[in-house]
Interface confidence: low
């Protein structure tokens, strides 16, 4: 009995379904075929699942959280034992095992592995301001989506017919920070927030006034 | 209220026919699985049947496999236990009960366990 | 098939110790289960996971469970604790539940 190699790591957005395959070939017919589907959660690598199991003709479901969501993407039994996954969940990620054995056929690789990755795009990110409006201050622009995996880029950019930022800006698209230095009257303006990441992009607005002092009265 | 209540027993003839009804009420009933377990007078508790949340898998023990089927309705938050050719050993009180199964690993299968039960509906089976 | 054998049954004086076993083949590589059933009653679920108590359950219950045995133990028993206790495993997921033939636990 051997399982064929797997492509490797699959990536899926959140909500879309995943089919983890897994294909193997063998000499006896398939009279005792035993099919047991696991996954490592990336979340909790302590405590390996049941996704879906395949035992003396009959399918069983594994853990709760897959009921109604797994099934195998053929019929059984077969070589082969691709499952597929619906309204794939960001839990789903993990290392995903299938281990097949099938009596009287022993020996060779039982064993397929799979990486599964749930994506999702960045969540409607929140824009503000840190530090003094006042003209001359050092303003800091923040930018940050609550959820995005791969985990979401930040570009700040300003709505101006330029797109530029002012040239005493420094940008950090990591952290979703843009620092204006010694802000004036041509730092005013909106400025846009767009987070993206590999499957998606989200965007917020910030509107900048820069405050300049009053005259004084002379009397 | 987090309940089960069962309905549907009765006296039967042998080789007769009966359909029991479970309808459970304050919890997510699809996100269960759930088993019937007789018990028969003055006797202890016999499991018989389970099926999961989704209601993909069902399960017998032996003595009811090929006679009695179990079935669930999630939209009417009900279960169902269909027995057919009964027999006079099949006399018993019936419970629903809400069964928790937890995964097993590689090397162990997962248990079930039974945390919340009815209050029976008795099944007499007679001539 | 898999068998649980428990007494058939235990008494105790109230206050004290009440020890119910339950055993069977490997029973300490299965997880085990146990439930109490007053007369006419159903059956309530008193320890699961060989040592887990429900919320509701007093600490007075514990369990544990190894080599081929698994025991109830209630401490400082009760009046109310009178019942009959059953002993349960799986023997997988396609066997949802053996029970054993049930303890009756009588306080003196």
């Known amino acids: 009995l051997e399982v064929s190699e797997s492509p490797g790591s699959i990536q899926v957005a959140r909500g879309q379904p995943a089919v983890l395959p897994c294909t193997f070939t063998t000499s006896a017919a398939l009279i005792n075929l035993n099919v047991i589907w696991m996954v490592t959660p990336l979340s909790n690598a302590n405590q390996p699942e049941q996704v879906i199991l395949y035992q003396g003709g009959q399918m069983f479901d594994g853990a709760p959280r897959f009921h109604g969501r797994v099934g195998f993407t053929g019929t059984m039994p077969a070589t082969n034992v691709s499952i597929f996954i619906n309204n794939t969940q960001l839990s789903d990620t993990g290392t995903y095992q299938c281990l097949v054995n099938n009596l009287p056929d022993i020996g060779g690789r039982n064993i397929g592995v799979t990486g599964l990755t749930v994506l999702v795009p960045p969540s409607a990110p929140h824009c503000q301001i840190q530090g003094s409006q006042d003209i001359g201050s050092d303003v800091i622009l923040l930018c940050s989506s609550e959820e995005g995996i791969p985990r979401p880029t930040y570009l700040w950019e300003k709505l101006d017919n330029t797109l530029k930022l002012p040239p005493t800006a420094t940008q950090d698209q990591v952290q979703g920070t843009v620092t204006i230095r010694n802000i004036s009257a041509l730092s005013s303006g909106l400025y846009q927030c767009v987070a993206s990441n590999a499957i998606g992009t989200s965007t917020c607005l910030l509107d900048l006034q820069v405050i300049s002092p009053q005259p004084r009265n002379i009397g | 209220e987090v309940q089960l209540l069962e309905s549907g027993g009765g006296l039967v003839q042998p080789g007769g026919s009966l359909r029991l009804s479970c309808a459970a009420s304050g919890f997510t009933f699809s996100s269960y699985a759930m088993s019937w377990v007789r018990q028969a007078p003055g006797k202890g508790l016999e499991w018989v049947s389970a099926?999961?949340?989704?209601?993909?898998?069902?399960y017998y023990a032996d003595s009811v496999k090929g006679r009695f089927t179990i079935s669930r309705d999630n939209s009417k938050n009900t279960l169902y236990l269909q027995m057919n050719s009964l027999r006079a050993e099949d006399t018993a009180v019936y419970y629903c009960a809400r069964g928790q199964y937890v995964s097993g690993t590689y090397y162990s299968y997962g248990y079930w366990y039974f945390d919340l039960w009815g209050r029976g509906t008795l099944v007499t089976v007679s001539s | 098939s898999y068998e649980l054998t428990q007494p058939p049954s235990v008494s105790v004086s109230p206050g004290q110790t009440a020890s119910i076993t339950c055993s069977g083949d490997?029973?300490?590589?299965?997880?085990a289960s146990w439930y109490q059933q007053k007369p006419g009653q159903s059956p309530v679920l008193v320890i699961y996971?060989?040592?887990k108590r429900p919320s509701g359950i007093p600490e007075r219950f514990s369990g544990s469970n190894s080599g081929n045995t698994a025991t109830l133990t209630i401490s400082g028993t009760q009046a109310e604790d009178e019942a009959d206790y059953y002993c349960?495993?799986?023997?997988?997921?396609?066997?949802?539940?053996?029970f054993g033939g049930g303890t009756k636990l009588t306080v003196l």
């Open positions: 996971q060989d040592s």
């Open positions: 490997k029973l300490g590589d299965k997880y």
């Open positions: 349960q495993v799986s023997r997988g997921h396609t066997s949802a539940g053996v």
């Open positions: 099926i999961s949340g989704s209601g993909g898998s069902t």
